[in-house]
Amino acid sequence: AGVFELQIHSFGPGPGPGAPRSPCSARLPCRLFFRVCLKPGLSEEAAESPCALGAALSARGPVYTEQPGAPAPDLPLPDGLLQVPFRDAWPGTFSFIIETWREELGDQIGGPAWSLLARVAGRRRLAAGGPWARDIQRAGAWELRFSYRARCEPPAVGTACTRLCRPRSAPSRCGPGLRPCAPLEDECEAPLVCRAGCSPEHGFCEQPGECRCLEGWTGPLCTVPVSTSSCLSPRGPSSATTGCLVPGPGPCDGNPCANGGSCSETPRSFECTCPRGFYGLRCEVSGVTCADGPCFNGGLCVGGADPDSAYICHCPPGFQGSNCEKRVDRCSLQPCRNGGLCLDLGHALRCRCRAGFAGPRCEHDLDDCAGRACANGGTCVEGGGAHRCSCALGFGGRDCRERADPCAARPCAHGGRCYAHFSGLVCACAPGYMGARCEFPVHPDGASALPAA
């Protein structure tokens, strides 16, 4: 058992021309969230088993509103990792699909609207317990930068999280620096130490002292990107400067970019500009193909005829979308208006309306004065998303249909007595007070304390 962890570093327009506009606008603020789906990489049943290793959904990111005229920046991301727990062995090779979703927060009827912005997929080799692996993927004009790792949950250990190690009651049986390992009580296990200098980012080991490279890296310590080498022969010891005696191959020599990508040198390494349909650090990832298992929910994947559609998913009943990601039922057509909840009763659909709405489709706005009659001369007043009747004197209730007791609210101040009257109420004031509601004290000299004009 263990956890696959995905950290999204950035999502925004990729380099090069055709950079997309921000997915949010001043009129339609939005926020991002991510979904990751994992499948065993070489599993034959991967096509039929959607997200067989698990899936996770991120939290929603901060709300973003486009600044008019500003270039589309990297978009604000949700906090935290996406974590996909796995119960069985970590397969070592896995396929992933990472989707970037946009939640529009405009005035959609029925709440926010979701749309898929980008989807990337790939197959990777990864040992559990190894360091974070970094990746860059492009989907159309968007670029997603992320890191991922798989780690075992105690007591599981090993590159597949299949061995169980737990402290024993008598750990002294093992020498210093060693720990006892179950299921064999008499076996002592050394903490795994890779070859000295093995790259913590690009290498890992399954046996002590070895250094195995993650995909895309080579060299004894996994520090050399595939197809590149920094120098053929170093300068002699007398040389004060570093560099190459014979101009060695530059980072682009031998073109590390696959699938017709073009290479350009950068201060630290190289960068590939990929042809349409390919992306990744070395253009090694083709769009998404059936090999990536992109069809969810048991969809059948068929290779597409042209580069723009590398695959087509034939969805099983009840699902649709380019990757069979959308559950389709009779409520999918959104028969309920104004945010009503659709319930499929089998023989019919029913709408459960939000407060303030009614009708079979929640189409009637109860908070709307249109067509709303206030009885007994009352007038309808809208405000705050609700309506109310402002009733004529002597009437009350939601629709002014109830005869009001004008004295119920004790309107006469300073102990005045209230009498209901056909035109409203009359206050009989206590000695020393006057006014329609007995609100003004009468001074001993006979003057009243009326407010100044």
């Epitope: 009827i109 029925g110 009943p317 009840g318 649709q320 389709v328 039922d329 009779r330 999918s332 057509l333 959104q334 028969p335 208006r337 089998g346 023989h347 019919a348 659909l349 029913r350 709408c351 079979p360 489709r361």
Partner: antibody, heavy 120, light 107 residues
Framework: EVQLVQSGAEVKKPGASVKVSCKAS????????MNWVRQAPGQRLEWIGI????????IYNHKFKGRATLTVDKSANTAYMELSSLRSEDTAVYYC?????????????WGQGTTVTVSS | DIQMTQSPSSLSASVGDRVTITCHAS??????MGWLQQKPGKAPKGLIY???NLEDGVPSRFSGSGSGADYTLTISSLQPEDFATYYC?????????FGGGTKVEIK
């Protein structure tokens, strides 16, 4: 009286697109979904897709995915079905048919049909 | 997709006969099906919804029954205007699917 009146017959070349209209009257247009169904000569009826005229939400038969587009003009009480990349096997009579959006009545009223002929 | 298998594909009957047409769905559809009538050169017309309910204006000689995956349309006493092709349709699940039709001809 409920009526669905469709546009006239069309003759198109392979690869072209066709847009068929269906004007509704006699009921509240946005209270009923609009289905589109076709019938090729001597063949069974085939469902293309459905649209909720109130919200514009659509669901398509995966067989027509990417080729059929359903839209509505609420102000004109009219539904449209556009089929692109026409092939000879798209030669058929195309029908619109309304369906109650809640009680799920089967398609009770149908348009008179629009014959689309695809021929080079 | 749910397959709708209709039988017979055609039948000959006389005015006054009792006619039964059956439709079998490849999986249970909980009554979410209907029957349509189509005359040559005309659009289909709804007859029955939810397996057993008559659409407005449909004569009571038409009736529907069934549950699960098996449904029946019965015309108790065939009239001259009933000679047509009848289709079943399921709307339990997208995509909606139709039976192959039963042509009712005059004997």
């Amino acid at each position: 009286e409920v009526q669905l009146v469709q546009s006239g017959a069309e003759v198109k070349k392979p690869g072209a697109s066709v847009k068929v209209s269906c004007k509704a009257s006699g009921y509240t247009f946005t209270d009923y979904y609009m289905n589109w169904v076709r019938q090729a000569p001597g063949q069974r009826l085939e469902w293309i897709g459905i649209i909720n005229p109130y919200s514009g939400v659509t669901i398509y038969n995966h067989k027509f995915k990417g080729r059929a587009t359903l839209t509505v003009d609420k102000s004109a009480n009219t539904a449209y079905m556009e089929l692109s990349s026409l092939r000879s096997e798209d030669t058929a009579v195309y029908y619109c048919a309304r369906q109650d959006s809640l009680l799920d009545y089967a398609m009770d009223y149908w348009g008179q049909g629009t014959t689309v002929t695809v021929s080079s | 997709d749910i397959q709708m298998t209709q039988s017979p594909s055609s039948l000959s009957a006389s005015v006054g006969d009792r006619v039964t047409i059956t439709c079998h769905a490849s999986q249970g559809i909980s009554g979410n099906m209907g029957w349509l009538q189509q005359k040559p050169g005309k659009a289909p017309k709804g007859l029955i919804y939810h397996g057993a309910n008559l659409e407005d204006g449909v004569p009571s000689r038409f009736s529907g029954s069934g549950s699960g995956a098996d449904y029946t349309l019965t015309i108790s006493s065939l009239q001259p205007e009933d000679f047509a092709t009848y289709y079943c349709v399921q709307y339990a699940q997208f995509p909606y699917t139709f039976g192959g039709g039963t042509k009712v001809e005059i004997k």
